[in-house]
């Protein structure tokens, strides 16, 4: 459920990596090379603020091995994970205290994959079995995407269930993934 098979123009299926609200803890050799917010692009948001750090759609890199049954990639692949919030909810006046308060309604912005890349890998298998060529689909960049209540589900359908809108008044809590679930995401491919 965390990922869907993506059919490209080819005859092969590439598993699509889902959106990770937070980097999974079990990824090995975590290279948290946080690139510029939004991968060097200006944040996609309507809010006016001087503090860009409020809009932290980060591209984090992790390395891990691709597996397919007993076979494992000769080298680990570097996987980009979209992480962080895309900014505060809309800032609205508080009629009672004449102050300001954060209202969690209004347009919703999510840090989601923007572009993908296909990585060719070689899987080495035990027992003298011939190596296999495979292709995995990896996130190439992330972006803040505006989601309204009318289309948020369809916009996110490609990125798994964890991207669903959080309950009102609650801080979104990333869903932990098991090592097995993570492993499945890079399996097979073409």
């Amino acid at each position: 459920q965390g990922w869907q098979a993506f059919k490209n123009d080819a005859t092969e299926i590439i598993p699509e990596l889902g959106e990770y609200p937070e980097p999974p803890p079990e990824l090995e050799n975590n290279k948290t090379m946080n690139r510029a917010e939004n991968g060097g692009r200006p944040p996609h948001h309507p809010f006016e603020t001087k503090d860009v750090s409020e809009y932290s759609c980060r591209e984090l890199h992790f390395t891990r091995y691709v597996t397919d049954g007993p076979c494992r990639s000769a080298k680990p692949v570097t996987e980009l994970v979209c992480s962080g919030q895309c900014g505060p909810a809309r800032l609205l006046p508080n009629a009672i205290g004449r102050g300001k308060w954060w209202r969690p309604s209004g347009p919703d912005f999510r840090c989601i994959p923007d572009r993908y890349r296909a990585q060719r890998v070689q899987l080495l298998c035990p027992g003298g079995e011939a190596p296999r060529a495979r292709k995995v689909r990896l996130v190439a960049s992330c972006k803040c995407k505006r989601l309204t209540r009318f289309h948020n589900q369809s916009e996110l359908k490609d990125f798994g269930t964890e991207a669903a809108r959080p309950q009102k008044g609650r801080k979104p809590r990333p869903r932990a993934r098991s090592a097995k679930a993570n492993q499945a995401e890079l399996e097979n491919a073409y």
């Epitope: 080819a10 005859t11 092969e12 290279k31 090379m33 890199h61 000769a74 080298k75 570097t78 980009l80 890349r117 296909a118 060719r120 890998v121 070689q122 011939a130 190596p131 296999r132 060529a133 495979r134 292709k135 190439a140 073409y190």
Partner: antibody
């Protein structure tokens, strides 16, 4: 030693089809993607597509969909490319080439097969 | 698709001098700190031959007078000192995104 041995030159009539072969040796055939590249004076080097010998799965350049069909025979470690409905624009040299992992590039090339389409 | 623009289309260099070939990509070919740009040499009647991979790595068996540099969208192939056997056409190719694409080629001639 890695080698990609391609079939000989072809002279074909417009509208006909041609099937080029590429026999691989010196490495595990199923472990590497095989790519095909077209070279014509007008268009420099053009990527046609790739095939995964392990699964038979293919990816094509949009421009060559319906024109090229890639297949493999694992038992003989041979990759094939069929070109159909040939026109003069298909006259070119065609290369099979292996995609390496380190280097992550087209590291070994066949000698090329010249296809001439003429009536 | 990523478009690669090579310049110049041709150049003539004296023996022992430096040849510099440029390749500009329509978008970045960087992924996780690696720049997926490769350089090939092709002589008449022969297939292309890999010289440089991931922007700056010299392929095994290639003389050290060949070097590659650059990142993001701008890349350079340098040959110094140029030798007679270097007369050929040189192509850049990106392997970051499918479909893989090639530059238009630069023909190097000796003066």
């Amino acid at each position: 030693e890695v080698q990609l041995q391609q079939s000989g030159p072809e002279l074909v009539k417009p509208g006909a089809s041609v099937k080029i072969s590429c026999k691989a040796s010196g490495y595990p055939f199923t472990g590497y993607f095989m790519h095909w590249v077209k070279q014509s004076p007008e268009n420099s080097l053009e990527w046609i597509g790739e095939i995964n010998p392990s699964t038979g799965g293919t990816t094509y350049n949009q421009r060559f969909k319906g024109k090229a069909t890639l297949t493999v025979d694992k038992s003989s470690s041979t990759a094939y490319m069929q070109l159909k409905s040939l026109t003069s624009e298909d006259s070119a040299v065609y290369y099979c080439t292996r995609w390496g992992y380190n280097p992550y590039a087209l590291d070994y090339w066949g000698q090329g097969t010249s296809v001439t389409v003429s009536s | 698709d990523i478009v690669l623009t090579q310049s110049p289309a041709s150049l003539a260099v004296s023996l022992g001098q430096r040849a510099t070939i440029s390749c500009k990509a329509s978008q970045s070919v960087d992924y996780a700190g690696d720049n997926y740009m490769n350089w090939y040499q092709q002589k008449p009647g022969q297939p292309p031959k890999l010289l440089i991979y991931t922007a700056s790595n010299l392929e095994s068996g290639i003389p050290a007078r060949f070097s590659g540099s650059g990142s993001g969208t701008d890349f350079t192939l340098n040959i110094h000192p140029v030798e007679e056997e270097d007369a050929a056409t040189y192509y850049c190719q990106q392997s970051n995104e499918d479909p893989p694409t090639f530059g238009g080629g630069t023909k190097l001639e000796l003066k």
